[in-house]
């Protein structure tokens, strides 16, 4: 429809009590320059007066020349293309609809923008890749649908409550398309990180806690094994018995198969967690280990060197 004014701005902006909101906005009027601008809160059209009713937060003909440091609401735009707004501080009762009433010489327009102000700082959102595998570098992303020039914030990463050593890259967007603050952390998780809690903490400029989001790491890894042998020194005489036990300390996902290897070769029919060698002979000396597999791959225990001595 060519008889419309053209506006570009984020559809909804988010903030919390006491913070601020910066609303990037561009427009194109139907004819010539803007003559006046009124910012309404929750405007309603009054058919009797043919005018809009609602709280007037800003009126260009009144507020345009009031020193900006005295104004909670500022119109940072101009009369032909910029309609950027700032509300600082923003309050809970500012939530609702902002109505930008624009008037040129012959045309009028009401543009609406949604403002969602929460009582307390809302939490950021941690985004993880669909799968995390041990020793493979991944990027953890923490996203907050907030950014405002008058209210600096920071996002900090914690692992089990301890600040992560890796350097995070923080970026902000304050454009007509999107408003957000994002922190990205490159991280090579080890199997021991599986099940650990990662936190993205929102802090103010002074490092004061505002809110956080937490996730539990799901690190896919091959089974991690411990091998135990009786006798513990793995030195026996011919005819003695030896017992080796394979313990799975961690596996994600669950293991599927178990096998034993001697000198790198699989022992047939040995598919349990216990390897019993009865009346051993000298030729059974060698390096033993257990191998347990899951969907990620096989995990091997350390090798045990069995020495069978003459009786």
């Amino acid at each position: 429809d060519s008889s419309k004014w053209v506006f570009e701005h984020p559809e909804t902006l988010y903030a919390w009590e006491g913070a601020c909101v910066w609303i990037p906005c561009t427009y194109r009027a139907l004819d010539g320059d803007l003559e006046s601008f009124i910012l309404f809160h929750n405007p309603e059209y009054n058919k009797n007066t043919s005018k809009f009713d609602g709280t007037r937060l800003y009126e260009s003909t009144k507020d345009g020349k009031v020193p900006s440091e005295q104004k909670r609401v500022q119109f940072l735009g101009d009369k032909n293309k910029n309609c950027t707004l700032s509300i600082h501080p923003v309050h809970l009762n500012d939530s609702g609809q902002l109505g930008l009433r624009m008037e040129s010489k012959t045309e009028k327009w009401m543009e609406r923008i949604h403002l969602n102000v929460s009582e307390r700082p809302f939490p950021p959102h941690i985004q993880l890749p669909p799968e995390i595998q041990e020793s493979q570098e991944v990027t953890l992303t923490c996203l907050l649908n907030f950014s405002c020039y008058g209210y600096p914030i920071q996002l900090q990463w914690l692992l089990e409550g301890v600040p992560m050593r890796q350097a995070a890259v923080t970026s902000t967007s304050l454009t007509i398309k999107s408003v957000f603050t994002r922190s990205e952390l490159k991280f090579s998780p080890q199997w021991s990180h599986h099940g650990k809690i990662v936190t993205c903490q929102l802090q103010d400029a002074d490092g004061k806690f505002l809110s956080n989001d937490t996730v539990q790491l799901n690190v896919k890894h091959t089974p991690k094994l411990e091998i135990k042998v009786t006798p513990s020194d793995a030195i026996v005489r011919e005819g003695d018995s030896v017992t080796m036990t394979c313990e799975v300390s961690s596996s994600n996902p669950e293991y599927t198969t178990v096998s034993w290897l001697k000198d790198g070769t699989s022992l047939k029919k040995q598919n349990t967690f216990t390897l019993n060698l009865r009346e051993v002979t000298k030729d059974q000396s060698g390096k033993y280990c257990c191998q347990v597999s899951n969907d990620v791959g096989p995990g091997r225990s350390e090798e045990v060197f069995l020495q069978v001595q003459y009786a």
Epitope: L34, S36, T61, K62, G64, K65, P67, S68
Partner: antibody, heavy 120, light 112 residues
């Protein structure tokens, strides 16, 4: 055509009061700042203060605060300057002037002025 | 308060002369929004002032092109490139950036 017409001037004794009126026409009165400016005989211009008729907000030059009060009646499209405790040095021509733009700001329309003489 | 000091206080000139009036503010009159609300008004005896220049250098509609404004920060100038008979008047600079708004004391341009 945008017009401002002042009235209410005249001779008043020291210590007396006077209310000047500025009747506006030809524009939306409630949506422009109205300023009062005065000029003593043979002297320069002096800004007194201003009012936004839409909500009654005012700003004053410090030397007039307390003695002078600016008000407006949107139903009559008229701004007022109430002057109390008048002194001889308040003798001047008083002008009302409209702040005429949302963006550029200037006194684009002035009234013809009304003379106030404070004398015993 | 911001003082606006004009110089000269008066000058005599002939038709066709180039006339320059300066105005100096006691402090910067850049408004917090970034604009400089510096205006020039012309006043003839017994008449209300008339706007010539706004925001330092913008000519008001209907004002002849021989009038121009320039300057920044604290120093401003009104120039009449070729004085005409109807230009003999008193000229005032005005700052509308900070309260209280203030006028210069005026410069009277007389016929030589």
């Amino acid at each position: 055509e945008v017009q401002l017409v002042e009235s209410g001037g005249g001779l008043v004794q020291p210590g007396g009061s006077l209310r000047l009126s500025c009747a506006a026409s030809g524009y939306e009165f409630s949506r422009s700042w109205m300023n009062w400016v005065r000029q003593a005989p043979g002297k320069g211009l002096e800004w007194v203060g201003r009012i936004y008729p839409g909500d009654g907000d005012t700003n004053y030059s410090g030397k007039f605060k307390g003695r002078f009060t600016i008000s407006a009646d949107t139903s009559k499209n008229t701004a007022y300057l109430q002057m109390n405790s008048l002194r001889a040095e308040d003798t001047a021509v008083y002008y009302c002037a409209r702040d005429g733009s949302s963006w550029d700001w200037y006194f684009d329309v002035w009234g013809q002025g009304t003379l106030v003489t404070v004398s015993s | 308060d911001i003082q606006m000091t004009q110089s000269p206080s008066s000058l005599s000139a002939s038709v066709g002369d180039r006339v320059t009036i300066t105005c100096r503010s006691s402090q910067s009159i850049v408004h917090s929004a970034g604009n400089t609300f510096l205006e020039w008004y012309q006043q003839k005896p017994g008449k209300a002032p008339k706007l010539l220049i706004y925001k330092v250098s913008n000519r008001f509609s209907g004002v002849p092109s021989r009038f121009s404004g320039s300057g920044s920060g604290t120093d401003f100038t009104l120039t009449i490139s070729s004085l005409q008979p109807e230009d003999f008047a008193t000229y005032y600079c005005f700052q509308g950036s900070q309260f209280p708004y203030t006028f210069g004391q005026g410069t009277k341009v007389e016929i030589k």
